[in-house]
């Protein structure tokens, strides 16, 4: 065959899309149907991933790269390389063993996946609740109650004026 043989490992001459046939003086055999080798020098081809059921094909398998799957509408990927598909829920819900359940009072979820999280406790930062939380949205914290006393401004006060004759440092 027309390829320079390597002195170290003759199999290293076999490109992706082939496997090294050790039984026949390191001839490179094309990968059989529905299999691939994504790197050179491989001694076997791997079976292509099949995107079936709730999985759908995002990228077709080729003799040089595996198929890539994502999830059918209503589901989202979990795990490396989308190894699992998990059911979507609505915003304001979380997935439990019994299906999608509304977030409990005091918690929210603004996505179709994941768990309900507690509303932010504005008072921990010395602030007040400006907008109440819902199942879908966190609370919006505003200025601290002291900042809202009569005559107080919520706008940052201007910096004190410099004395005449002094230039900035």
């Amino acid at each position: 065959f027309e390829r320079t043989r390597s002195l170290q490992d003759p199999c290293s001459n076999c490109p992706a899309g082939t496997f090294c046939d050790n039984n026949r003086n390191q001839i490179c055999s094309p990968c059989p149907p529905n299999s691939f080798s994504s790197a050179g020098g491989q001694r076997t081809c791997d079976i292509c991933r099949q995107c079936k059921g709730v999985f759908r094909t995002r990228k077709e398998c080729s003799s040089t790269s595996n198929a890539e799957c994502d999830c059918t509408p209503g589901f989202h990927c979990l795990g490396a390389g989308c190894s699992m598909c998990e059911q979507d829920c609505k915003q304001g819900q979380e997935l439990t063993k019994k299906g999608c359940k509304d977030c409990c009072f005091g918690t929210f979820n603004d996505q179709k996946r994941g768990i309900c999280r507690p509303w932010t406790n504005c008072s921990l930062d010395g602030k007040s609740v400006l907008v109440n939380g819902t199942k879908e949205r966190d609370v919006v914290c505003g200025p601290s109650p002291a900042d809202l006393s009569p005559g107080a401004s919520s706008v940052t006060p201007p910096a004190p004026a410099r004395e005449p004759g002094h230039s900035p440092q």
Partner: antibody, heavy 114, light 108 residues
């Protein structure tokens, strides 16, 4: 959908040359090795040559070694077969096929006759 | 090179019949065997790969079995469109790719 279209077949005299082309569409051509397979009139299938996805590895059947050259241009999604010193026994329909042999072109007829 | 031998070389059958074609390899090829169907004036079409896996879009009346040196292609209930020539091909020790000589399936 996957499509392979061969062209370049013709009637030629023994000893002459011919170049066949195979244009691919509907898949990532540069990710697949490619074959040429031929079929003499009324006969079975005979594998001719294979080229890896990147053009680095080629292999030929003994019957065409030294006379035929396989090549590809991935930027044009095209596979080629340069056939020199043609003989009467090269008369056949030539098919290109993906390395898995799962998709084939419709074939192009090469007739070698004086 | 591995030689592939098909039998019979031709056979006649009727619509609805169950038909079996066999393919024998000159040495063990594990399950690296593919089956093709070819109709006159058309390119071959992959039916079965890896001895028993049905190619996408192929009707389920086609099935394959076997491993090592002996393989079979079975059509459970012949349809009019199944009359064609069938080839086996090994992808265990290639190149060269080697095909069987073909089995011509004709209407009785």
């Amino acid at each position: 959908q996957v499509q392979l279209v061969e062209s370049g077949g013709d009637v030629v005299q023994p000893g002459r040359s011919l170049r066949l082309s195979c244009t691919a569409s509907g898949f990532t051509f540069s990710s697949f090795g490619m074959h040429w397979v031929r079929q003499a009139p009324g006969k079975g299938l005979e594998w001719v040559t294979f080229l890896s996805y990147d053009g680095s590895y080629k292999y030929y059947a003994d019957s065409v070694k030294g006379r035929f050259t396989i090549s590809r241009d991935n930027s044009k999604n095209t596979l080629y077969l340069q056939m020199n010193s043609l003989r009467a026994e090269d008369t056949a329909i030539f098919y290109c096929a993906r390395d898995w042999l799962d998709y084939w072109g419709q074939g192009t007829l090469v007739t070698v006759s004086s | 090179d591995i030689q592939m031998t098909q039998s019979p070389s031709s056979l006649s059958a009727s619509v609805g019949d169950r038909v079996t074609i066999t393919c024998r390899a000159s040495q063990s090829i594990s399950s690296y065997l593919n089956w093709y169907q070819q109709k006159p004036g058309k390119a071959p079409k992959l039916l079965i790969y890896a001895a028993s896996s049905l190619q996408s879009g192929v009707p389920s009346r086609f099935s394959g079995s076997g491993s090592g040196t002996d393989f079979t292609l079975t059509i459970s209930s012949l349809q009019p469109e199944d009359f064609a020539t069938y080839y086996c091909q090994q992808s265990y020790s290639t190149p060269p790719i080697t095909f069987g000589q073909g089995t011509r399936l004709e209407i009785k």
